[in-house]
C-alpha cells in the first residue's frame, strides 16, 4: 500500500480536515471544565480528572487509553500546622507573621482543598537569624555579594526575589553560600506590569498573591527515590537522605505585601546598583539584619511540610499508525496544577483535548496517520516532571528505538502578543513551513500568515526575514525525551512582548488567581490565540506522523553547530594565555562541525532524489533522520548530571529553564579563573572539547551513506 491508500485521504486534504475541525469554542469549554476545582498531583480530584480524560479520549475515538500509575515522592503542607515566617523581637515574641493563605478570588471563596502557598520539598525547620537580601539569588548575585561586597551569607536567612532563573537554582545557590533558610517573594518590578490592574480587575499580581513551586535540583532524575528507573510496584526506593535533589534548608514563598514588611526594616549595606532594586517602597538594603531601631529583631521561619510517597496517574492514549505503527510521535502535556491551573497547565490540556477530538473525528471517518500518535496527560509535572519521567523510564527501550518526535503541550499562553517556539533545529523548517500556512490571529495582521506576524514581532537575531526560535532548556515535560533520550522535541505557545514587559513569566503564575476568568476576561476572550496554538501543536504532530519523509532538515543542525562552536570558542578565547599554556585547541570541534555540514548537505541531496516508492529505502532514510537526534546522546551523560545526556544542549547549570549549547565545555570554562587548580580545570576543558568533537563527528557519520 502507498501512504495515501493507507490513510484514505490525500495528504493536503488530511491536514486541512484536521485543522478545520479544531474549534476555539471547544477549547474554551474544555478549559472551563478543567479549572473549576484544584487538581493538585496526588489528590483524589486529579485522579478523577485522569479518569474523565481517559473516558473522553476513548469517546473521541482513540484506539486505546490507559492509566499509567507510579508511586513517587511528593510534598504537602501540614494541614494543622501551617507554614509561615515571623519577625520576632528580642524576647522571641512574634511581632509580625506572613499570611497563611492567599485571599481567594471572587467566586471561589467556598472552594475547598486550595493548597496554601509553599515551596514543595522544603525540609521542616524553624531557623531564626538575620536577613540578607540577595536580589534574584543567581550565581552572579552571590558573586557580587561574596566577592565584591564581602558579605557572608553563612548562618543567615536569605530573601530573594522570584524571576530570571528557576527557583531551584536560587535555593541551590543559597545553600552553597551557607544560608540556613530561604524566603522567596514576588517583587512588583517582576510581577506587576505598569498600567494594568491587579486581579480580579486585571492580570497583575495582587499583594497577597504568592507563587508556589518545587525547589528541587533533580537534573533530570525524575522521582527523587528511584532515579533512572520507574517508581513501580516493585521499585527499590532510596532512603530520604540519599534522595536526589532535595533541598537541605527550609524555604518558603511570600507575596509583596509580606515582603514589604520584611524588607522595609533592612539595614547593612546599600544595594550595589540599580539592578538590585525592585519596585517596593523599601531601600533594598542587603543587610545583614535590620536597621538600628530594629537591630535586635530577627526573622524566624516555621516550616512543617512533609514529603510523602504518593500515587500519580498519567493518561496515555494511542492512535495506531497505518503504515509504520512502530514509529511514535508523542503529544504530551501535564494535567496537575498548583490550584485551578487556568493557564498552567489547563490552557495546554484543553488544546490537547481538542487536538485529540479532531484526530478522533478523522479516524471515525476512516483515516489513520502513517505513524502511531501517542497522547499523554502527565501527572506531577509541578513536583519535578515526575509523571513524564517515570513513564519514559518505564518505556525507555521502546522510546529510544521508536520515538520520532515529542511535542510538548503545557500552557498555551503566557501572553497574547506573538508566537514563541523552542525546538530542536531538526524542526525549524517544519515550523517555518507550517506557520506560513496558518492564519495570524493578531490584530493588524488580518489576512496575513502566522509566519509573517511572528517574524515581524519576534525577529531572529541572526537571520533577517525569519522568526526567533529558541533552544530547548528544561522545566517542562519534554526534558526526559530530549535531554535524556535524544528524541527530537519542540514546544510552542503564545507569549508576551518581551521588549515592553520585562516581568518574569506572567504575573499570576502558580497563584490562586490563575483561573478560567483570568484567561476568558483578560488574555484570550475569543480563544483565538488558543486556537492558533492548537493549530501549531496539532499541525506539527500531524506532519510528523503523516508525512512520507520525516519533516526534519539536518542542514539546520549544521548551521547551529557552527554558531555554537563559534560562541564557545569566543568564550574560551577570553583566556588566550591559558589556552596557549595548556595547549587548548578547538580544531577537532571545528573539523567535526565542517564534516557534519558536508555530510548533512549530501544527505539532503540524496533525500530529494531517492525512490520514495521503495519502502525499504524510505524507511532507511527516515531512520537516519529519526536517529540523528539520538546520535547526540552521550551514554555517560554530562559531569555530575548523568540524566542530561545530550551533548549539544542541556539545561543551564545556573538556570534550569534556559538551554545551554555545548554545556560540557561551557561548564568546564565557567568561572575558570577562580579554580584552585588551573591545570586540572583546563584539562577538563580539553576533555569536554574532545567529547563534543567526537559526538558531532559520530552524529555526522550516521548521515553518511550506509554502505
Amino acid at each position: 500500500k502507498s501512504s495515501n491508500e493507507a490513510t484514505n485521504i490525500t495528504p493536503k486534504h488530511n491536514m486541512k480536515a484536521f485543522l478545520d475541525e479544531l474549534k476555539a469554542e471547544n477549547i474554551k469549554k474544555f478549559l472551563y471544565n478543567f479549572t473549576q476545582i484544584p487538581h493538585l498531583a496526588g489528590t483524589e480530584q486529579n485522579f478523577q480528572l485522569a479518569k474523565q480524560i481517559q473516558s473522553q479520549w476513548k469517546e473521541f475515538g482513540l484506539d486505546s487509553v490507559e492509566l499509567a500509575h507510579y508511586d513517587v515522592l511528593l510534598s504537602y503542607p501540614n494541614k494543622t500546622h501551617p507554614n509561615y515566617i515571623s519577625i520576632i523581637n528580642e524576647d522571641g515574641n512574634e511581632i509580625f507573621n506572613t499570611s497563611l493563605f492567599e485571599p481567594p478570588p471572587p467566586g471561589y471563596e467556598n472552594v475547598s482543598d486550595i493548597v496554601p502557598p509553599f515551596s514543595a520539598f522544603s525540609p521542616q525547620g524553624m531557623p531564626e537569624g538575620d536577613l540578607v537580601y540577595v536580589n534574584y539569588a543567581r550565581t552572579e548575585d552571590f558573586f557580587k555579594l561574596e566577592r565584591d561586597m564581602k558579605i557572608n551569607c553563612s548562618g543567615k536567612i536569605v530573601i530573594a526575589r522570584y524571576g530570571k532563573v528557576f527557583r531551584g537554582n536560587k535555593v541551590k545557590n543559597a545553600q552553597l553560600a551557607g544560608a540556613k533558610g530561604v524566603i522567596l517573594y514576588s517583587d512588583p518590578a517582576d510581577y506587576f506590569a505598569p498600567g494594568v490592574k491587579s486581579y480580579p480587575d486585571g492580570w497583575n499580581l495582587p499583594g497577597g498573591g504568592v507563587q508556589r513551586g518545587n525547589i528541587l535540583n533533580l537534573n533530570g532524575a525524575g522521582d527523587p527515590l528511584t532515579p533512572g528507573y520507574p517508581a513501580n510496584e516493585y521499585a527499590y526506593r532510596r532512603g530520604i537522605a540519599e534522595a536526589v535533589g532535595l533541598p537541605s534548608i527550609p524555604v518558603h514563598p511570600i507575596g509583596y505585601y509580606d515582603a514589604q514588611k520584611l524588607l522595609e526594616k533592612m539595614g547593612g549595606s546599600a544595594p550595589p546598583d540599580s539592578s538590585w532594586r525592585g519596585s517596593l517602597k523599601v531601600p533594598y538594603n542587603v543587610g545583614p539584619g535590620f536597621t538600628g531601631n530594629f537591630s535586635t529583631q530577627k526573622v524566624k521561619m516555621h516550616i512543617h511540610s512533609t514529603n510523602e510517597v504518593t500515587r500519580i496517574y498519567n493518561v496515555i492514549g494511542t492512535l495506531r499508525g497505518a503504515v509504520e505503527p512502530d514509529r511514535y510521535v508523542i503529544l504530551g502535556g501535564h494535567r496537575d496544577s498548583w490550584v485551578f491551573g487556568g493557564i498552567d497547565p489547563q490552557s495546554g490540556a484543553a488544546v490537547v483535548h481538542e487536538i485529540v477530538r479532531s484526530f478522533g473525528t478523522l479516524k471515525k471517518e476512516g483515516w489513520r496517520p502513517r505513524r502511531t500518535i501517542l497522547f499523554a496527560s502527565w501527572d506531577a509535572e509541578e513536583f519535578g516532571l515526575l509523571g513524564s519521567t517515570e513513564w519514559a523510564e518505564e518505556n525507555s527501550r521502546l522510546l529510544q528505538e521508536r520515538g520520532v518526535a515529542y511535542i510538548n503541550a503545557d500552557s498555551s499562553i503566557e501572553g497574547n502578543y506573538t508566537l514563541r517556539v523552542d525546538c530542536t533545529p531538526l524542526m525549524y523548517s517544519l515550523v517555518h513551513n507550517l506557520t506560513k500556512e496558518l492564519k495570524s490571529p493578531d490584530e493588524g495582521f488580518e489576512g496575513k500568515s502566522l509566519y509573517e506576524s511572528w517574524t515581524k514581532k519576534s525577529p531572529s537575531p541572526e537571520f533577517s526575514g525569519m522568526p526567533r526560535i529558541s533552544k530547548l532548556g528544561s522545566g517542562n515535560d519534554f526534558e526526559v525525551f530530549f535531554q535524556r533520550l535524544g528524541i527530537a522535541s519542540g514546544r510552542a505557545r503564545y507569549t508576551k512582548n518581551w521588549e515592553t514587559n520585562k516581568f518574569s513569566g506572567y504575573p499570576l503564575y502558580h497563584s490562586v488567581y490563575e483561573t478560567y476568568e483570568l484567561v476568558e476576561k483578560f488574555y484570550d476572550p475569543m480563544f483565538k490565540y488558543h486556537l492558533t496554538v492548537a493549530q501549531v501543536r496539532g499541525g506539527m504532530v500531524f506532519e510528523l506522523a503523516n508525512s512520507i519523509v520525516l519533516p526534519f532538515d539536518c542542514r539546520d543542525y549544521a548551521v547551529v553547530l557552527r554558531k555554537y562552536a563559534d560562541k564557545i570558542y569566543s568564550i574560551s578565547m577570553k583566556h588566550p594565555q591559558e589556552m596557549k599554556t595548556y595547549s587548548v585547541s578547538f580544531d577537532s570541534l571545528f573539523s567535526a562541525v565542517k564534516n557534519f555540514t558536508e555530510i548533512a548537505s549530501k544527505f539532503s541531496e540524496r533525500l530529494q532524489d531517492f525512490d520514495k516508492s521503495n519502502p525499504i529505502v524510505l524507511r532507511m532514510m527516515n531512520d537516519q533522520l529519526m536517529f540523528l537526534e539520538r546520535a547526540f546522546i552521550d551514554p555517560l551523560g554530562l559531569p555530575d548530571r548523568p540524566f542530561y545526556r545530550h551533548v549539544i544542549y542541556a539545561p543551564s547549570s545556573h538556570n534550569k529553564y534556559a538551554g545551554e549549547s555545548f554545556p560540557g565545555i561551557y561548564d568546564a570554562l565557567f568561572d575558570i579563573e577562580s579554580k584552585v587548580d588551573p591545570s586540572k580545570a583546563w584539562g577538563e576543558v580539553k576533555r569536554q572539547i574532545y567529547v563534543a568533537a567526537f559526538t558531532v563527528q559520530a552524529a555526522a557519520e550516521t548521515l553518511s551513506e550506509v554502505a
Epitope: 509580625f96 499570611s99 497563611l100 493563605f101 492567599e102 471563596e109 499583594g207 505585601y257 509580606d258
Partner: nanobody, 123 residues
C-alpha cells in the same frame, strides 16, 4: 446587599467580660482584614483592633492590649471581639469595619461599617 451587623453588646460591671459578634453578608469576609472601632459618648472614633483576612496578625490599641482579643471564623462569615477585664472607659458604641484592600497586612481605610452595638461598663 453588603452589610455588617454587630451584636453582643450590653451593660456589664467593671472586671466582667463580653463577646461581640459581627456577621458579614453580601461579600466574602475571607478576603478582607477587619477592624473593631469604638465611639465613646460625646467623643470621636477610636480604632480598637485589626485582624488580617487569614488571622495571621492581630493588632490592638494600647488601651485594650492584653484585655481584648479579636478573632474571626471565615467559614461562618463572622468577626468577634472578646472583651475581658472591662473598665468604665470602655463604654462606647462598638462598630466592626471592613478594610478597603483585599489581603492587606496592616489596617487601612475602612469602606463598610456596621450599625454598632452599645457596651456600657458601670458599677
Amino acid at each position: 446587599e453588603v452589610q455588617l451587623v454587630e451584636s453582643g453588646g450590653g451593660a456589664v460591671q467593671p472586671g466582667r467580660s463580653l463577646r461581640l459578634s459581627c456577621a458579614a453578608s453580601g461579600f466574602p469576609l475571607i478576603s478582607y482584614g477587619m477592624n473593631w472601632v469604638r465611639q465613646a459618648p460625646g467623643k470621636g472614633l477610636d480604632w480598637v483592633a485589626f485582624i488580617t483576612y487569614d488571622g495571621s496578625n492581630r493588632y490592638y490599641a494600647d488601651s485594650v492590649k492584653g484585655r481584648f482579643t479579636i478573632s474571626r471564623d471565615n467559614s461562618k462569615n463572622t468577626l468577634y471581639l472578646q472583651m475581658n477585664s472591662l473598665r468604665p472607659e470602655d463604654t462606647a458604641v462598638y462598630y466592626c469595619a471592613k478594610d478597603r484592600i483585599v489581603g492587606a497586612r496592616v489596617p487601612d481605610a475602612y469602606d463598610i461599617w456596621g450599625q454598632g452595638t452599645m457596651v456600657t461598663v458601670s458599677s
